[in-house]
Structure formats: C-alpha cells, structure tokens
Interface confidence: low
C-alpha cells in the first residue's frame, strides 16, 4: 500500500487496460497499473489518470492513505458526449438540471423520483410515460387476482423520501444540494458523490462517502423464502468489519444491505445516512470516512437501464439521506 | 453579461507597491477562478497567479514573494497586490476569468518611474 | 521553468484553413496541460477561445477548434475571415502554474 517495501509487481509485463484508461507506473515508480478514474478510490501505490488531470484527494492529512481522484479545479466535465465547463449548469433532458463542478457532474431531478410501496389504496404502483408529458407518473394496476385481504395489508405503507430540500434558503444563499449519486459498485466497497453549497461559505463543493449496497460474497437469493419473489433488506447474520484498500474498521457495524428480486425487480437503498467509520491500516495509521449506512432499501421495476444515463443514475440514487 | 473591471493607479515609484481590484460581474467568484496576467513589449505575455474559486492560490515561482492574490466573495472583488517594484515591472496587468481564460478585464497600465 | 513555443507568424486566405500549434519544451503536450488559446484584437483586446485543451469558450464560432497533434497542442482556424486576422496565445499548465507562449500573428490575406 505505501512505497516503503521492495518492489513486487503483480501482473507482468503489464495489466491490460479498459479503453480510455491509460497504463501508468504506480506512485512509487515500481510497477506499471491502470490508473484510476474519476470517483475511484487511489492510494500512493493507485495513482489517479494524469493524462485526465486526476489527483488523489485524500481530503485531510489525516487520511493520506486512501482518497478519492478527483479533478483539479476548474476541470471540465464530459457528460452525454457534450463538454461541460466547471461552474457551468445545463439541463441534460427535461428530468435533470444539472451542474459541472471540477469535472464531477451533480444533477437534481425535475421530476418527482420517490419510490411508491405498495399500499391500500394502490397495492400495485407502476410508474409509466403518459404521452406529452415529460414526467412519469404512477398509476396502479388492478391486482391479477383478487386474494389481498384484510390483516394482510397492514404490511403496506407509502415510505416517506426525507432529504435535505434543494432550494432550502439561508441567509444570503440558496442553499442546493444534489442527491448522492448511485453507490459506484453494485457489491462490495464503492464510491456516491453529491454536489452542495451547504456550507460555511455557500460555495458549491463535492463531497464523497464510502458505500456498500451489498456485500459480493453474500448468495442472497438463496434466502428468498419459499412463495416470494424478493429479500428486500437481507438479516445479516452477524455484525461485521469494513475492508478498505488493506485497512480495517476500528468497529464491528451490524449494517444492512440491500437484497435481491428474482422477478426482474432491483433493490436498492431508499433511506440513507452518512455516518464516520475509522479505519485502521497495517502500519497502525488510522484514518476516518464517510460512509453510506442504509436504513429501508425499496424493491422497484425502475431498475437502472444501461441506455439511459439518467435513469441508471437516478433510480438508483440514494434516497432520503438523514446525514 | 461577464463583465471584469479594473481599477488601479497607473504610475508608481521604485520599490512602491501595486494595488489592483477587480470587481467582476455576471458570475460568481465562488464558481470561476480569476487569473493575473501581464504584458510587456519585451517579455510577451507573463501568468502572474491565481484565485481559485475556493480560495486556494497558485502563483508565478518567479512573483511568489512579492505577490499577493485575495478575494471577498460576496462584494465580487478581486485584490491583487505586488510589492518591491522596479522600472522592468512596467507593463500592462489584466485580471481574467478561469475557464480557457474566456474574460478579461480591460487592463491597468502600470508604469514604474522615479 | 518550461518554455512554450509558438510559430511567430501564419498567412492565410478567407476561407482557408490554417493549423497554430503550441510546443512544450519538457516534454509533450497532454491533457493535463489544460491547453488554451487565446485571441488579441487591436487596443489590447483578449478573448479566450479555447479551453481544456478543445473545450470551446461560450459565444465562440465554431471555425475554432482545439486539439493535440503529435506531441503539441493546437488551434485549428477552418474557413477563416478576415476577422480572424489577430495575434494568437496558447498557455500550458504545469501542475502548479500557466506559462504562456510568444503568440502567433495570423494574416488573413484578402
């Protein structure tokens, strides 16, 4: 993790690259690795795309193990094939406005994003494209047989989406933040970002937190009970240790993670919070994250479509955040 | 529309200081950067520093003990300040927007005699 | 500190092409360079015209473009007018700070 030791270089005679991801020697000058990108996290052995104008951003000296590249002020931002230029704010499609800062893009939806549960009144909610309108909107299907009875639906609620309000105003500022972006891994330790003014100085910043939708080695839907078709928040058996790049929390944390759906369904976080989690790493340093604790994940058809950036990055945005 | 002006003297003496402002409109200090550049027959044009939107400052290895950037957000002004000044500082010095250095101000020419 | 070079002079026709190129004396020019260009009218009048190495500034014609080319960064003029007639500046970022080059004189010849 750190240049002390000798050089041991993995993958000889060099890691074979994604497109667009340039082969770099690593921070201590030993081994040839694929640099990260925008949003990954690096260490002194990962350095970040130089050829993107990326550093790592360890955020305080205290972390200066694992950080988060980031582009340098003012970088521009590529989004949807346009350049967008830092501070500049555009309108992506009638759903988002969104706003280049440092090559970070944050957007803020226009339309309404909550995720409806099931409930009395509407015990199958879809949501679908109403013709010359822009928003969708939810309708509800008539169940395909009429079985739900009485007792049965106090299981059903509406879940309220909490959240900083965007256009909340403090003195002399319009106070906007934009939704924490979906958890860059579908499993494992991943990376959400938003773009806020809530602070000090009213000055437009990113932020970044460490988030785990689920954990990879977990067989969840093996769990599934017998007749349904989802797990929406998985019981975690016993409370566990976050891995960080050779670091280890300090705690032990009973998390929750979101299931799995074998009926097309996804499962993604729908209440949030960002709390801090110390790390401690081999050569005893310790440093301190922000990371994403979910508290209700939602079991939904508006699962990420991989044509469509916008509904892969904000159906499975982070709802409701407590942080 | 982006608009960046400014307003210093244009004669000072040898070993006096330079103070320059630059009060921009139409955009944000907390959103765009601001440049100082100078130009002079001899030496083309010369980037002095920068504010960064953050307030964070990178300077001219050359200028950096003598030179001085600060900013106040909120009336939307830029201070540029240089000290020690000599005959060869004589140039004209212009503030810029960051961002492909799109806007500049309309320039302050300084010419440093006794 | 690093030296950028430009050519000192270009000519051209109205509607003619011509290719500005600006050179880094320690190495290529890459993205991370932050490439830009910049136009000067008469009366000291700068307009940025490129950024980002080829981001466009607002306003700015399309006739204008910006790019790498080998180990150099570079300003395409295509179908020049004879507005375009003007001294042109790149500047290349160093990690730390902007050096500018000597500037090219475009002549639209017309």
């Known amino acids: 993790q750190n240049c002390s030791g000798p050089c041991r270089c993995p993958d000889e005679p060099a890691p074979r690259c994604p497109a667009g991801v340039s082969l770099v020697l690593d921070g201590c000058g030993c081994c040839r690795v694929c640099a990260k990108q925008l949003g990954e996290l690096c260490t002194e052995r990962d350095p970040c795309d130089p050829h993107k104008g990326l550093f790592c951003d360890f955020g305080s000296p205290a972390n200066r193990k694992i950080g988060v590249c980031t582009a340098k002020d003012g970088a521009p931002c590529i989004f949807g094939g346009t350049v967008y230029r830092s501070g500049e704010s555009f309108q992506s499609s009638c759903k988002y406005q969104c706003t280049c800062l440092d090559g970070a893009v944050g957007c803020m939806p226009l339309c309404s994003m909550d995720v409806r549960l099931p409930s009395p009144d509407c015990p199958f909610p879809r949501r679908v494209k109403l013709p010359g309108k822009c928003c969708e909107e939810w309708v509800c299907d008539e169940p395909k047989d009429q079985t739900v009875v009485g007792p049965a639906l106090a299981a059903y609620r509406l879940e309220d989406t909490f959240g900083p309000d965007p256009t909340m105003i403090r003195a002399n500022c319009l106070v906007q933040t934009t939704e924490w972006s979906a958890c860059s891994k579908t499993c494992g330790m991943g990376i959400s970002t938003r773009v806020t003014n809530d602070n000090a100085s009213c000055r437009l910043e990113k932020q970044s937190r460490l988030c785990m939708v689920r954990p990879c080695e977990a067989d969840l839907e093996e769990n599934i009970k017998k007749g349904k078709k989802c797990i929406r928040t998985p019981k975690i058996s016993k409370p566990i240790k976050f891995e960080l790049s050779g670091c280890t929390s300090m705690k032990t944390y009973r998390a929750k993670f979101c299931g799995v759906c074998t009926d097309g369904r996804c499962c993604t976080p729908h209440r949030t919070t960002t709390l801090p989690v110390e790390f401690k790493c081999p050569d005893g340093e310790v440093m301190k994250k922000n990371m994403m604790f979910i508290k209700t994940c939602a079991c939904h058809y508006n699962c990420p479509g991989d044509n469509d950036i916008f509904e892969s990055l904000y159906y499975r945005k982070m709802y409701g955040d407590m942080a | 529309q982006v608009q960046l002006k400014q307003s210093g003297p244009g004669l000072v003496q040898p070993s006096q200081s330079l103070s320059i402002t630059c009060t921009v409109s139409?955009?944000?200090?907390?959103?765009?950067?601001v440049h100082w550049i100078r130009q002079s027959p001899g030496k083309g044009l010369e980037w002095l520093g920068v504010?960064?939107?953050?307030?964070?400052?990178d300077y001219n290895a050359a200028f950096m003990s003598r030179l001085s950037i600060t900013k106040d957000n909120s009336r939307s002004h830029v201070f540029f300040k240089m000290t020690s000044l000599q005959t060869d500082d004589s140039a004209i010095y212009y503030c810029?927007?960051?961002?492909?250095?799109?806007?500049w101000g309309q320039g302050t020419t300084l010419t440093v005699s006794s | 500190q690093a030296v950028v070079t430009q050519e000192s002079a270009l000519t051209t026709s109205p509607g003619g092409t011509v290719i500005l190129t600006c050179r880094s004396s320690?190495?290529?020019?890459?993205?991370?360079?932050?490439a830009n260009w910049v136009q000067e009218k008469p009366d000291h009048l700068f307009t940025g015209l490129i950024g980002?190495?080829?981001n466009r500034a607002p306003g700015v014609p399309v006739r204008f473009s910006g790019s790498l080319i080998g180990d150099k960064a570079a300003l395409t003029i295509t179908g020049a007018q004879a507005e375009d007639d003007a001294m042109y500046f790149c500047?290349?970022?160093?990690?730390?700070?902007?050096?500018f080059g000597g500037g090219t004189k475009v002549t639209v010849l017309g």
């Open positions: 504010i960064w939107r953050r307030g964070g400052t």
């Open positions: 500047a290349l970022w160093y990690s730390t700070h902007y050096v």
């Open positions: 139409g955009f944000s200090l907390t959103t765009f950067g």
């Open positions: 320690i190495g290529a020019v890459t993205t991370s360079n932050y």
């Open positions: 810029a927007r960051d961002g492909g250095f799109d806007y």
């Open positions: 980002g190495t080829s």
